[in-house]
């Protein structure tokens, strides 16, 4: 038994960020005369939260009217709680001293824990695009949550991924925490429409996890396949040659025609067709005047896709003095291109 006891009935209080915390405190006596003060923490570095005697504490209100006679309820409310408010709060009775007030009795303390929601997960992919069959890393970050316990999962198109590493920082006690996870994803040619999802579950989210997404369209580069073909003769001395550029992504593509190594025409892919898998097809054609050539003509379709080194496909037009039946052709063997004989 003591002359005056300061009673803090709650050992701990759990409050959601943004809400109001009520910290309860009663005294068993009003004598000796002196103010009640609230502190966060103990020892010389403690932080004054409220002083009954003087000061301006805009976030703090008293639960009862401390100017009312015989009031021994010194409970306070702290508004708009943030994770930075977490800590142990002490209700302390001071007695009038000469000249300064003297700490008289302290309550046992109430630990305020703040439940703070994690921020929306932010998923970021590699800085440069990668091609199918390559493994790329995605990172997911979420901040500002408390308590520390949290669950993070990765998905690709709804399928859970297993190749990832996750860290929650800091390791020790803190007012709030951050999570950082890196997942490895193997790209396929069909991934233009794919999504990578980072899902974060936390006690504050009441079973409704937060998700961050990244579209693999931002990450993948599907290089084109080229096919150069000769169309039937349009006129006696003209041949139409087409370059089919298939299954490429992204759209940024520049095509150059070369006749015997000399640039004939350059164009940029514009009116492309989109495939179901999100890749694009495009076709360019070149009309060649055969009569202008005395010798065989080597036509090359050269494609620069998305700033990458150019790829090309060639086609040989043979200029022959022995006409054959119009429309017949043979494919040259052991070459990387289609060979046509023209009369």
């Amino acid at each position: 038994e003591e002359e005056l006891q300061v009673i803090q009935p709650d050992k701990s209080v759990l409050v959601a960020a943004g809400e109001t915390a009520t910290l309860r405190c009663t005294a068993t006596s009003l004598i000796p005369v002196g103010p009640i003060q609230w502190f966060r923490g103990a020892g010389p570095g403690r932080e004054l939260i409220y002083n009954q005697k003087e000061g301006h504490f805009p976030r703090v209100t008293t639960v009862s009217d401390l100017t009312k006679r015989n009031n021994m309820d010194f409970s306070i409310r702290i508004g708009n709680i943030t994770p930075a408010d977490a800590g142990t709060y002490y209700c302390v009775k001071f007695r009038k001293g000469s000249p300064d007030d003297v700490e008289f009795k302290s309550g046992a303390g109430t630990e305020l824990s703040v439940r703070a929601k994690p921020s929306a997960p932010v998923v970021s992919g590699p800085a440069a695009r990668a091609t199918p069959q390559h493994t790329v890393s995605f990172t997911c970050e979420s901040h500002g949550f408390s308590p520390r316990d949290i669950t993070l999962k990765w998905f690709k198109n709804g399928n859970e991924l297993s190749d990832f590493q996750t860290n929650v920082d800091p390791v020790g006690e803190s007012v709030s925490y951050s999570i950082h996870s890196t997942a490895k994803v193997v790209l396929t040619r069909e991934d233009v429409h794919s999504q990578v999802i980072c899902e974060v579950a936390h006690v504050t989210l009441q079973g409704d996890p937060l998700r961050g997404t990244a579209n693999l369209s931002e990450t993948i580069r599907v290089p084109p396949t080229l096919e150069v073909t000769q169309q039937p003769v349009r006129a006696e001395n003209q041949v139409n040659v087409t370059c089919q550029v298939r299954k490429f992504y992204p759209q940024r593509l520049q095509l150059t025609w070369l006749e015997n190594g000399n640039v004939s025409r350059t164009e940029t892919a514009s009116t492309v067709t989109e495939n179901k898998d999100g890749t694009y097809n495009w076709m360019s054609w070149l009309l060649v005047n055969v009569s202008a050539h005395r010798d065989d003509v080597k036509l090359t379709c050269q494609v620069e896709h998305d700033g990458q080194p150019a790829v090309s496909k060639s086609h040989d037009l043979k200029v022959s003095a022995h006409p054959k039946e119009q429309g017949s052709n043979t494919a040259a063997e052991n070459t990387g291109s289609n060979e046509r004989n023209i009369y």
Partner: antibody, heavy 114, light 111 residues
């Protein structure tokens, strides 16, 4: 139950030091303060000072230069020393519990005389 | 120092009547919503007995015939109705400021 009992010499010579003991029971001296109050014959009450449960003290400024209050918690005793006494210090000396003065000893009479 | 002036110095009351004692402080004894003024009864050869604390609160075991009121500098102790064994000296006391002080006392006699 709570009890306080003052003891000490009934007669002190002028200029000497008056020494009194208050022996308490029924409460802890680490939890409660103890006051000393005196009452000259036929007069009113005068507060001398208090020793708090933490051992700190507050004194009547009129007597401060001559007064010392101390405690021995192991023996449940509080001590009053008043130096350089004169006939004006003749009084019944009481000890009383706490800032509220809710329990009092019966008092001990001290006469200052040569 | 806060000086407490009690009046009257003495008072004779018949049993069943009301006795009123006032105590005026030289400065306010109010702090933090309370009045740190207390009342004691002292009979000859006995120590003071607490009656009222914080101006108006009855100490346990004290009959409800005793009541206290007031705030700031002016306080009153009322005994109603007075009984024969209420004959005693009555003191007010403040512990709002050091040094704690007592009033000069009021002697209540029963007619």
């Amino acid at each position: 139950q709570v009890q306080l009992q003052e003891s000490g010499p009934g007669l002190v010579k002028p200029s000497q030091t008056l020494s009194l003991t208050c022996t308490v029971s029924g409460f802890s001296l680490t939890g409660y303060g103890v006051n000393w109050i005196r009452q000259p014959p036929g007069k009113g009450l005068e507060w001398i000072g208090i020793i708090w449960g933490d051992g700190s003290t507050d004194y009547n400024s009129a007597l401060k230069s001559r007064v010392t209050i101390s405690v021995d918690t192991s023996k449940n005793q509080v001590f009053l020393k008043l130096s350089s006494v004169t006939a004006a210090d003749t009084a019944v000396y009481y000890c009383a519990r706490a800032g509220k003065m809710d329990y009092w000893g019966q008092g001990t009479t001290v006469t200052v005389s040569s | 120092d806060i000086v407490l002036t009690q009046s009257p110095a003495s008072l004779a009351v018949s049993p069943g009547q009301r006795a009123t004692i006032t105590c005026r402080a030289s400065e306010s004894v109010d702090s933090y919503g309370n009045s740190f003024m207390h009342w004691y009864q002292q009979k000859p050869g006995q120590p003071p007995k607490p009656l009222i604390y914080l101006a108006s609160n009855l100490e346990s075991g004290v009959p409800a015939r005793f009541s206290g009121s007031g705030s700031g500098t002016d306080f009153t102790l009322t005994i109603n109705p007075v009984e024969a064994n209420d004959a005693a000296n009555y003191y007010c006391q403040q512990n709002n400021e050091y040094p704690w002080t007592f009033g000069g006392g009021t002697k209540v006699e029963i007619k």
